[in-house]
Interface confidence: medium
Amino acid sequence: ASVATELRCQCLQTLQGIHPKNIQSVNVKSPGPHCAQTEVIATLKNGRKACLNPASPIVKKIIEKMLNSDKSN
């Protein structure tokens, strides 16, 4: 069974390369009983979803930028 079906994680694997301009919003799900790992789920401008690697420096920058833009709105 995959990680997703073994726990209740939503991220089967993470997308390695993604350009920030393609991202509409980002949701960071903290670990919990449903899933032992932090999950970063991006909603893309085409409406699709993608899981990003929370340990990636680029992803960390994207999250920081998104959170800052949320605060300024």
């Epitope: 069974a1 995959s2 997703a4 079906t5 073994e6 726990l7 209740r8 994680c9 939503q10 991220c11 089967l12 694997q13 993470t14 997308l15 949701n27 799900k29 919990g32 009983p33 449903h34 789920i41 909603t43 699709r48 979803k49 993608a50 899981c51």
Partner: antibody, heavy 125, light 107 residues
Framework: EVQLLESGGGLVQPGGSLRLSCAAS????????MSWVRQAPGKGLEWVSA????????YYADAVKGRFTISRDNSKNTLYLQMNSLRAEDTAVYYC??????????????????WGQGTPVTVSS | DIQMTQSPSSLSASVGDRVTITCRAS??????LHWYQQKPGKAPKLLIY???NLESGVPSRFSGSGSGTDFTLTINSLQPEDFATYYC?????????FGQGTKLEIK
């Protein structure tokens, strides 16, 4: 055809036990999480329990924790709910539901997309 | 636990009407929300998954929107077969929780 068929419901006295079964067909049973959901007479839907595809992870509502046990036999394509120490408030129609994981690239989500017809459980003396 | 609150709890409408049902989560759940329809004596049926995606075979007069804590199910041009009870459900975390339901009745 994708199908779920519950059985095992009936009348039981308070403090008694019952085991519900849910026979699955038409899909790869071992790949998907499954849930039990109940509905008391005239009331709304209440999630009871869920189990992962392999059976290695289980989840329960607080109201049934310690009394109910969810399990599955993937070789028989069957889901179970063992209900012990039954109370009057457990009276309900019990549904099993498949948690279809809609898979987009790099993303998985859980929706109860196939339901059984339900089996009634009455706890009364 | 995440509480889901639906409003209204009941609603009367006529064939052809446009109706809106709302669902509010007690904390942010992103778009981890589904909508179900249930008719008397029948099992629930999935209508909308992940807040806004139409389940296969569901008529396009049904639509969903929202993210975070506030969600909406809209039915455009009500048909006789749409009179039923509607439930929202979050799967952001366990325990999974449903709204209390909205009963849609014929006026």
């Amino acid at each position: 055809e994708v199908q779920l068929l519950e059985s095992g419901g009936g009348l039981v006295q308070p403090g008694g036990s019952l085991r519900l079964s849910c026979a699955a067909s038409g899909f790869t049973f071992s790949e998907l999480s499954m849930s039990w959901v109940r509905q008391a007479p005239g009331k709304g839907l209440e999630w009871v329990s869920a189990i992962s595809g392999s059976g290695g992870s289980t989840y329960y509502a607080d109201a049934v924790k310690g009394r109910f046990t969810i399990s599955r036999d993937n070789s028989k394509n069957t889901l179970y709910l063992q209900m012990n120490s039954l109370r009057a408030e457990d009276t309900a129609v019990y549904y099993c539901a498949r948690e279809g994981g809609r898979l987009e690239p790099y993303y998985y989500y859980y929706a109860m997309d196939v339901w059984g017809q339900g089996t009634p459980v009455t706890v009364s003396s | 636990d995440i509480q889901m609150t639906q409003s209204p709890s009941s609603l009367s409408a006529s064939v052809g009407d446009r109706v809106t049902i709302t669902c509010r989560a007690s904390q942010s759940i992103s778009d981890n929300l589904h909508w179900y329809q249930q008719k008397p004596g029948k099992a629930p049926k999935l209508l909308i998954y992940d807040a806004s995606n139409l389940e296969s075979g569901v008529p396009s007069r049904f639509s969903g929107s929202g993210s975070g804590t506030d969600f909406t199910l809209t039915i455009n041009s009500l048909q006789p077969e749409d009179f039923a009870t509607y439930y929202c459900q979050q799967y952001y975390s366990t325990p999974l929780t449903f709204g209390q339901g909205t009963k849609l009745e014929i006026k």
